[in-house]
Every structure is written in C-alpha cells, then in structure tokens.
C-alpha cells in the first residue's frame, strides 16, 4: 500500500529565540511528507505546515497566543502522493515533541547596546528593548513588556586599557555607572532571567567602547 515505506519523524526539537519558535525534526523525507499539529495541554490540535517536505515548521503564530502555556506538537508522516493512506493501525504514523513552555524556555536573543552617554564621571548605558512577535491589542510587545521584572540585564564594563571586568545589574533597560575621569571604557550586556532553571542567559551583546560613534561625551 506504500505505507510500509513511511517512517516516523524523530529527534523533534524546539528552536526558539525571543519567542520566534520553530519545531525541527528528522529524517529528510524520502517518498513521504509531513504535517504538524500543535496544542496546549488542554486544547484542541491545530494543524500547520500541511504535507510539507521540510523538516521544520514555524509555530510562532500559535505559541505567541499565550507564551505561558505549555505546548505539545506532533509530526505526522504520510506517503508522498497518497496522503489519505494510513498506517497499519488505521492512522498515520506520528511522533510527539517534548513539551515546550515559551516563557520558561525560549532562548534570550543577543541584546544590543542602543547608546551610552557620559556625563562627568557617570555613564548611562541603554539597552535596546527588542521587539518580539508576541502581540497584545494588535501591537507587538517588547521583551521587557513580556518578561517585566523577570528580565534583568547584566552589564560588563572595563577600562579599554585593561581586561578585568566590573558588573552592574538592572531590571530596566538602563544602567548608570561610575567611571574614572579621563578613562575610556568598553561595555557588553547580557540578558538574564534568574527565575529560570534553563536558558537563563543570553549571548553577550557586541562590545561597544567609548570613543566610538555610538556614544556621547559631555563634560560638566
């Protein structure tokens, strides 16, 4: 019947950064296609990526409806050109994904230092508030909107002439730090969600240094 050639998907993996969420799986299809379904624990299954030969499916539109829910996905395998065919048990082969809770598990994207401004011996460093694909009232929410005070930023800063780092923390998107007069400093920020048990830290922002165009210096 052709169904004997159909293999179940395996290695189902969630890839998610700042809520942009893609389900990936194996194997590359040979004479078969896939359809993905997703649901919350208590909800109905919704089909996505119908009869695709891809081995990934973008589920962002579904998970952003409620990022604090826990989601389960499953990948169905069908024989190519005969998608009505079912497996020996009377239904297509499928494999379940691990559970996925976006709020707790989405990776934090690399932050960006928006600007820094020196006024005397103080420097104000501002982190860009990155937009996510989570919506409220037809507006895309920022990372800060979604996580609130659960999200903090760690600033690593150091004199351009040395390598030893100092740190500062904020639960807004701004730091105000003390610096030595006449010294140039470099900055890098990291997003952190301390309440998490996994995926707690982001990769670091690109390093920005005083004396480059992003900053501004004002003598008081």
């Amino acid at each position: 019947s052709g169904t004997t050639n159909t293999v179940a998907a395996y290695n189902l993996t969630w890839k998610s950064t700042n809520f942009k969420t893609i389900l990936e799986w194996e194997p590359k299809p040979v004479n078969q296609v896939y359809t993905v379904q997703i649901s919350t624990k208590s909800g109905d299954w919704k089909s996505k990526c119908f009869y695709t030969t891809d081995t990934e499916c973008d589920l962002t539109d579904e998970i952003v409806k409620d990022v604090k829910q826990t989601y389960l996905a499953r990948v169905f395998s069908y024989p190519a050109g005969n998608v009505e065919s079912t497996g020996s048990a009377g239904e297509p082969l499928y494999e379940n994904s691990p559970e996925f809770t976006p709020y707790l598990e989405t990776n934090l994207g690399q932050p960006t230092i928006q600007s820094f401004e020196q006024v005397g011996t103080k420097v104000n460093v501002t982190v860009e508030d990155e937009r996510t694909l989570v919506r409220r009232n037809n507006t895309f929410l920022s990372l800060r909107d979604v996580f609130g005070k659960d999200l903090i930023y760690t600033l690593y800063y150091w004199k351009s002439s040395s390598s030893g780092k100092k740190t500062a923390k904020t639960n807004t998107n701004e730091f105000l730090i003390d610096v030595d007069k006449g010294e140039n400093y470099c900055f890098s920020v990291q997003a952190v969600i301390p309440s998490r048990t996994v995926n707690r830290k982001s990769t670091d922002s690109p390093v920005e240094c005083m004396g480059q165009e992003k900053g501004e210096f004002r003598e008081i």
Epitope: S163, K166, T167, D178, K201
Partner: antibody, heavy 121, light 107 residues
C-alpha cells in the same frame, strides 16, 4: 544535590604558582557565576575575583590583579584559580562560591569547603 | 570601593537573647546586601539576601532589615548553634565587599 569542591591547595614558596580547582556538581556552572573568596588565618572574608563561565568574562580584586587568573572548563563543570607570583600575604583558605540573582540582587548560595594555601619559604 | 562598616566586632550573649548586628554602607547599595554565618573551620553559609529575604532552610529567628545605608541582622532568640561569626556583604558594585565580621560568643 548542589556541591562545590575545591582542591589544589598546599605549601608553596614566595614567587611560586598554584592552581586551585572548583568542581561543581548538581548544577551547570555556565548558568551561574563563580566567585573566589579567601580568608587569611584569623581574618575576615576577602573577595578575590569572579568568572561568568557562559562567556568567560572575569574580574579581579586589585590585590591580585595581574597575578591571578580565573578560568572555567564548562565541559568539566569546573572553575579554576591560577595563582602566580605568590606572596606571604596570599596565605589563606580559598573558597569558591556560586552566585545567583534575586531580581538584580546577587547572593552566594553555595560555597565549597575551602582549600588552604600557605606561602612560605 | 564601597566600605561595609560592621558593628559590634564581637558580642557576648546568652541563649534566648535577642541579638542585633548592624552594617553601614559607605554609599547607597539599594537592597544589594547579604548576611552570612561562619563557624570555625567551615565555609560561610547564606542567611539573608536582598537585605531582608530569608534564605531557604534558614530558621525564622533570623531576619534582616534596611534603613537607607544601614542594614541590620537580628536573631530573635539566640540558640546554642548560633554562636558563630556573622558577615554582611554588598554586591551593588564591583568589587563586592564584606564587613569585618561580628563574633557572637557565649556569655
């Protein structure tokens, strides 16, 4: 169970070197921050330095800057304190500690048992 | 660097006494203060973080408070196992700094 175990302490001559290890179990060091703290005999606690094992960033107390180097091997879940150009005043029990955040406030919730470093001729 | 001035450096007290230890920061450190207990030959143990939060597993007779740049550790009713040295610590800025310690001895 979360545990930090230091090793590598001992007697060393002034000007000598020593490498201390801080082996972690029960958690992944890259998810946290590791600090080194020392305590001279009969004295209080003195911060030595820190590492963020996730990115390798380090910071040091002025008293050890240029002489001590902190590193981490995430595959071994272990942090290290390389101590060079040792002086008599570096004699102390050395502790590693795990740092976590409560909001923006840091706290050091797990400490190793300490390892004694004696610098003497 | 921020100085943490801890007082008293030592005190004698009896079981059941109420004990208060204070730390004054040389500048604003917000709530970024922790308190640790250390017994001879042992590593420090976290008692209080964020100035007033009791760490998991620590008896409720320990409490912390803040008033501006003054921080207080209170033991409401001293127990035999509480005789130890106590340290405050700020981590508002790098380097993190400790108070000099307060040794609580048996009267």
């Amino acid at each position: 169970e979360v545990q930090l175990v230091e090793s590598g302490g001992g007697l060393v001559q002034p000007g000598g070197s020593l490498r201390l290890s801080c082996a972690a179990s029960g958690f992944t060091i890259a998810d946290y921050w590791i600090h080194w703290v020392r305590q001279a005999p009969g004295k209080g606690l003195e911060w030595v330095g820190f590492i963020d094992p996730y990115n390798g960033y380090t910071g040091y107390a002025d008293s050890v800057k240029g002489r001590f180097t902190i590193s981490a091997d995430n595959s071994k879940n272990t942090a290290y304190l390389q101590m060079n150009s040792l002086r008599a005043e570096d004699t102390a029990v050395y502790y590693c500690a795990r740092a976590d955040y409560h909001g923006v406030d840091e706290y050091w919730d797990y400490w190793g048992q300490g390892t004694l470093v004696t610098v003497s001729s | 660097d921020i100085q943490m001035t801890q007082s008293p450096s030592s005190l004698s007290a009896s079981v059941g006494d109420r004990v208060t230890i204070t730390c004054r920061a040389s500048q604003d450190v917000n709530t970024a203060v922790a308190w640790y207990q250390q017994k001879p030959g042992k590593a420090p143990k976290l008692l209080i973080y964020s100035a007033s939060f009791l760490y998991s597993g620590v008896p409720s007779r320990f409490s912390g408070s803040r008033s501006g740049t003054d921080f207080t550790l209170t033991i409401s009713s001293l127990q035999p196992e509480d005789f130890a040295t106590y340290y405050c610590q700020q981590h508002y800025t790098t380097p993190p700094t400790f108070g000099q310690g307060t040794k609580v001895e048996i009267k």
